[in-house]
């Protein structure tokens, strides 16, 4: 009896694992083995596919074959008993195009109100993704074990910290990788669960902000208790992208080590141009807080996010404020090529009651003023990028008197 060729050959590639599956064409014939050949582009001869010769099952693994993953290959299969079937040719394919990204490895660390997630590619030193290691991004789904309500977090890197969690609560999560440059979305990791710790005695510092004053950066934060010391550390933001490396060498800012105030001042030349992460920790001598939320600090934006310059045109019941580009030391305007929001604070000169206006426009009307009254105005700029969330310092206050009652038109 002539042996029939196997049919429906499927090639599954996950990371560096190459698996072939096929259907027996004739279940009634026993003791049949199967063998594969492969052929590279531009070659005429077929080569035996190692790992896939004389296979008794309907699955084989040819991961040991060192292929150029960007080069098209063709496969063929036949059945063998005393005689052999004809070859069945599989459509040619390029391994890289066919490959799926496998589940990443996940390592969790718990604090009282935060979880640190370390993510590594599922296959260490993968050949398939050798040129794409730094391009991996990850997304995760996290939920409280007790509720099951899922939250999705997209576009994270190999280290991510989730804040504002509840103490002594079990959270579960799963992570998948993506190579957006190749339109590839991976498969989810197994579910990992971790319980946050009991609430720490000392909370972490909050509301960290960086501003520029003269040639210095001023770092400010809020803290619940008095008589504390603080330390500040920085890390190059790009290091969070480094696959497989989970040793993060946070560095001290020398002028911000063991400071007793909720701010510290350090020279701009501490940082070269770049994007950094900053974090603050509090200590009372006996106990130490966990680190604050990490804020992103871009020297380019920070250095040039100067307070706005503005002119006031006074009417009887309002001010018209015209915001211009801030001036550098040489009186040349700074070009700010990112969108800004302006915060304008104004108050009656004789009062402390401040009112605030937030505007995207550079011409702003301050309404409902009293005639012949001195009002003071100061302004600052904010970036509109949520992730950067930077603010300039306030401009110096400018005080003007409103006109008499009949000049409002």
């Amino acid at each position: 009896k002539n042996l029939k060729s196997p049919q429906k050959v499927e090639v599954d590639i996950i990371d560096d694992n190459f698996i072939l599956r096929w259907n027996r064409s004739d279940e009634s014939v026993g003791n049949v083995t199967f063998s594969f050949d492969y052929q590279k582009t531009g070659m005429d001869n077929w080569i035996k596919l190692s790992g896939c010769q004389n296979i008794t099952s309907t699955k084989c693994n040819f991961s040991s074959l060192k292929l150029n993953v960007y080069e098209e290959i063709k496969l063929r299969i036949r059945a063998e008993k005393e005689n052999t079937s004809s070859w069945y040719e599989v459509d040619s394919f390029t391994p890289f195009r066919k490959a799926q990204i496998g589940p990443p490895e996940v390592h969790l660390e718990a604090e009282d109100k935060a979880i640190v997630i370390h993510i590594s590619p599922g296959t260490k030193d993968s050949v398939m993704w050798a040129l794409d290691g730094l391009s991996f991004t990850y997304s995760l789904v996290i939920w409280k074990n007790s509720s099951g309500v899922e939250e999705r977090i997209e576009n994270i890197y190999s280290r991510h910290k989730i804040y504002k969690l509840s103490p002594e609560t079990t959270y579960c999560l799963k992570v998948k990788a993506a190579l957006l440059t190749s339109w590839k979305i991976g498969v989810y990791s197994p579910v990992h669960c971790i319980k946050t710790t009991v609430e720490n005695e000392l909370p972490p510092p909050e509301n960290i902000e960086v501003s520029v004053q003269n040639q210095n950066y001023v770092l400010k934060w809020d803290y619940t208790y008095a008589n504390m010391t603080f330390q500040v550390q920085w890390l190059h933001a790009f290091l969070k992208r480094n696959p497989g490396n989970h040793l993060y060498k946070w560095k001290q800012i020398p002028d911000c080590e063991n400071v007793k105030t909720t701010q510290c001042v350090f020279p701009q030349n501490v940082f070269q141009k770049g994007i950094y992460l900053l974090r603050v920790q509090a200590s009372d001598g006996n106990n130490t807080s966990f680190w604050s939320e990490e804020i992103k600090f871009d020297t380019e934006i920070q250095a040039f996010l100067l307070p706005p310059v503005f002119n006031i045109r006074s009417l009887s019941d309002s001010f018209h404020i015209y915001i211009g580009a801030p001036k550098q030391s040489g009186n040349t305007p700074v070009i700010q090529d990112y969108p800004l929001i302006y915060e304008i604070i104004f108050w009656e000169n004789t009062s402390n009651a401040e009112r605030k206006i937030i505007e995207k426009k550079t011409d702003v009307t301050v309404p409902n003023l009293k005639p012949l009254t001195v009002y003071c105005v100061k302004a600052r700029a904010h970036t509109m990028d949520e992730k950067l969330n930077k603010s300039s310092v306030f401009s110096d206050a400018v005080c003007e008197k409103t006109k008499p009652g009949n000049t409002s038109k």
């Epitope: 390592h107 969790l108 009282d112 009991v198 490396n245 989970h246 040793l247 060498k249 106990n287 130490t288």
Partner: antibody
């Protein structure tokens, strides 16, 4: 494979100094932290300090601050522990260890016995 | 400095027994705890890191758990090669500190 090989045993007099070395191979020391740990005879482990060989930044346990110096020579992949003003309670085995992923001291040297005796 | 207190300091046990060693921290260290095994005349060897992650190559009879201030190392069925001293260590804050050790002896 990763290896940390330490210098040989030392017998030194009280008040003197000693410098112990630890040579790493199978990895780039600049990518890691390098730690030193003390173990007195029959006692537990005490962390002395660590260095980041990439920029020579050091951290010391307050107990050892001022009397120990940790340095690194990246050209020879070697880190050093210098102990000064030695006294009898400094008699111990000193271990170097690599600080790797998740800040774990994952590989340790074989230890160097320093005996302080007059 | 963060104090770590291990208990018991000595433990006599037999092959096949289940053993539990605890480590208490004087303040919350998250899950930043490492467990080491040390045999006489040898360097310490990492068994467990980040409280519960077993190092590759360490037998599955070793497991770690806990968070905050209380941590546990369990050996589910003690083998002859497990008789050694075990140390916990916190890596949450400098200076790193170790527990005083638990010596596991043959009964």
């Amino acid at each position: 494979q990763v290896q940390l090989v330490q210098s040989g045993a030392e017998v030194v007099k009280p008040g003197a100094s000693v410098k112990v070395s630890c040579k790493g191979s199978g990895f780039n020391i600049k990518d890691y932290y390098m730690h030193w740990v003390k173990q007195a005879p029959g006692q537990g482990l005490e962390w002395i300090g660590r260095i980041d060989p990439e920029d020579a930044e050091t951290k010391y346990a307050p107990k050892f601050q001022g009397r120990v110096t940790i340095t690194a020579d990246t050209s020879t992949s070697t880190v050093y522990l210098e102990l000064s003003s030695l006294r009898s309670e400094d008699t111990a085995v000193y271990y170097c260890a690599r600080g790797g992923n998740f800040y774990v001291m994952d590989y340790w040297g074989q230890g160097t016995l320093v005996t302080v005796s007059s | 400095d963060i104090q770590l207190t291990q208990s018991p300091s000595f433990l006599s046990t037999s092959v096949g027994d289940r053993v539990t060693i605890t480590c208490k921290a004087s303040q919350n260290v998250g899950t930043n705890v490492v467990w080491y095994q040390q045999k006489p005349g040898k360097s310490p060897k990492v068994l467990i890191y980040s409280a519960s992650y077993r190092v590759s190559g360490v037998p599955s009879r070793f497991s770690g758990s806990g968070s905050g201030t209380e941590f546990t190392l369990i050996i589910s069925s003690v083998q002859p090669e497990d008789f050694a001293t075990y140390f916990c260590q916190q890596k949450n804050n400098y200076p790193y500190t170790f527990g005083q050790g638990t010596k596991l002896e043959i009964k």
